[in-house]
């Protein structure tokens, strides 16, 4: 805490500029008007203040805005953001994606801090949903972000945002997350034609129900075994041999190598031997 002392004659800051780096902490406290600082926040980043000096500037802003900083100040915090605590950030109302990007940029190269996590949380909650632009931004800064969200959090992703999802964004998602994302993807891509639709929906199929797999089997999609192995066991079990053959197309021969693994193993056990024999793969039910 800096003592309240009168500003020495001639030292009152008229603007935020380089001369302030020579001010002692108490001089900054006494001679820099908080309102001036707030209106000229964009200049702070261009000035090589010490951490101690930044502490003083933060203290001045805290006094000016005890209920939390306005977005006009937040957007220009720059490196001062690294001084904020999660408690500070919980007072903010960040609505602009530009503000979010500016602060994530400041933190780039650092680990995701509790401050950044709080900022993202506040931003997403403030928006009420994870819209496409936000998702784009977060996955660009933090690959894997999507799969770090719980199924409950993912439920706030609107179908339109699914267009921002790349296959690699789903690499670490588990089946329960795909259960939530799949219906959104199905809705998002519903107006695409067969082959284009399959390319887009493929990464989400770990959440697909039986009826959708049956429908896909009628569209000559040639699903690869890696995708088939990620399907829900309960969704695969009711499929007939003919449907699986159509679903996999030329990849059906790969069933032999996977016959002891789920979901293939459990599916084989559900089929009539006569039907399995039609595949000519030597599968034993």
């Amino acid at each position: 805490e800096v003592e309240k002392t009168a500003c020495p004659s001639g030292k009152k800051a008229r603007e935020i500029d380089e001369s302030l780096i020579f001010y002692k902490k108490w001089e900054l406290e006494a001679c820099v008007d908080a309102a001036l600082l707030a209106t000229q926040m964009d200049r702070v980043n261009a000035i090589p203040f010490t951490y101690e000096q930044l502490d003083v500037l933060k203290h001045k802003l805290d006094e000016l805005y005890p209920q939390g900083y306005p977005e006009s100040v937040i957007q220009h915090l720059g490196y001062l953001f690294l001084k904020m605590s999660p408690e500070d950030i919980r007072k903010w109302n960040v609505t602009s994606l530009e503000t979010l990007k500016a602060l994530l940029e400041v933190n780039k190269g650092h680990e995701m801090s509790p401050q950044v996590a709080t900022l993202i949380d506040r931003f997403v909650k403030g928006r009420g949903q994870l819209d496409k632009d936000t998702l784009d931004t977060l996955t660009a800064f933090y690959p894997g972000y999507l799969c770090s969200l719980s199924p409950e959090e993912l439920s706030s992703v609107p179908p339109s945002s699914i267009w921002a999802v790349r296959p690699q964004d789903l690499d670490t998602c588990d089946p329960r997350q795909l259960d939530v994302l799949y219906p959104k993807a199905r809705l998002a891509f519903q107006n695409m034609n067969g082959s284009e639709y399959f390319v887009k929906i493929q990464s989400f199929l770990g959440g697909a129900p039986t009826e959708d797999l049956k429908a896909l089997s009628q569209q000559n999609v040639s699903m690869d075994l890696a995708t088939f192995m990620k399907l829900r066991t309960d969704a695969v079990l009711p499929l007939t041999v003919a449907e699986v053959q159509k679903l996999l197309g030329p990849h059906v021969e790969g069933l032999k190598a996977e016959e002891r693994h789920r979901p293939v193993r459990d599916w084989i056990l559900r089929q009539r031997q006569d039907d399995l024999d039609t595949l000519g793969l030597g599968l034993q039910g």
């Epitope: 190269g109 650092h110 680990e111 995701m112 801090s113 509790p114 950044v116 996590a117 800064f141 933090y142 690959p143 894997g144 972000y145 799969c147 770090s148 969200l149 719980s150 199924p151 409950e152 959090e153 670490t172």
Partner: nanobody, 121 residues
């Protein structure tokens, strides 16, 4: 370097209980999702349960109501309480952590070495 150490596996009669632990180390704060997977002999690794960064949990259908996942953030440890165990639960159980926004060596996800659970009828 991120490391995961599982413990708590063992042999138990059907209907019995076990509590698995997975202690994570080698990273500071970031968004983390902890998951348990299992792999029976000759089978692929399958998802069992997860605890997400917001503290909510999820389970595969076959273990719902029998298994409970929880975590101790102070110790960076996740637990899997397994009750009413059945022979079908016999497998090697693996802990996995996914880190987002961490500067750590190697790439997420990270896997533990596994702990064996054997349930006899």
């Amino acid at each position: 370097e991120v490391q995961l150490a599982e413990s708590g596996g063992g042999s138990v009669q059907a209907g019995g209980s076990l509590r698995l632990s997975c202690a994570a180390s080698g990273y500071s704060y970031c968004r983390s999702t902890m998951r348990w997977y299992r792999q029976a002999p000759g089978n692929v690794r399958e998802f069992v349960s997860a605890i997400y960064s917001d503290g909510t949990t999820s389970y595969t259908d076959s273990v719902k109501g029998r298994f409970t996942i929880s975590q101790d953030n102070a110790k960076n440890t996740v637990y899997l309480q397994m009750n009413s165990l059945q022979p079908e639960d016999t497998a090697m159980y693996y802990c996995r952590i996914d880190l987002v926004g961490c500067n750590v060596a190697g790439g997420s996800p990270y896997w533990g070495q596994g702990t064996q659970v054997t349930v006899s009828s």
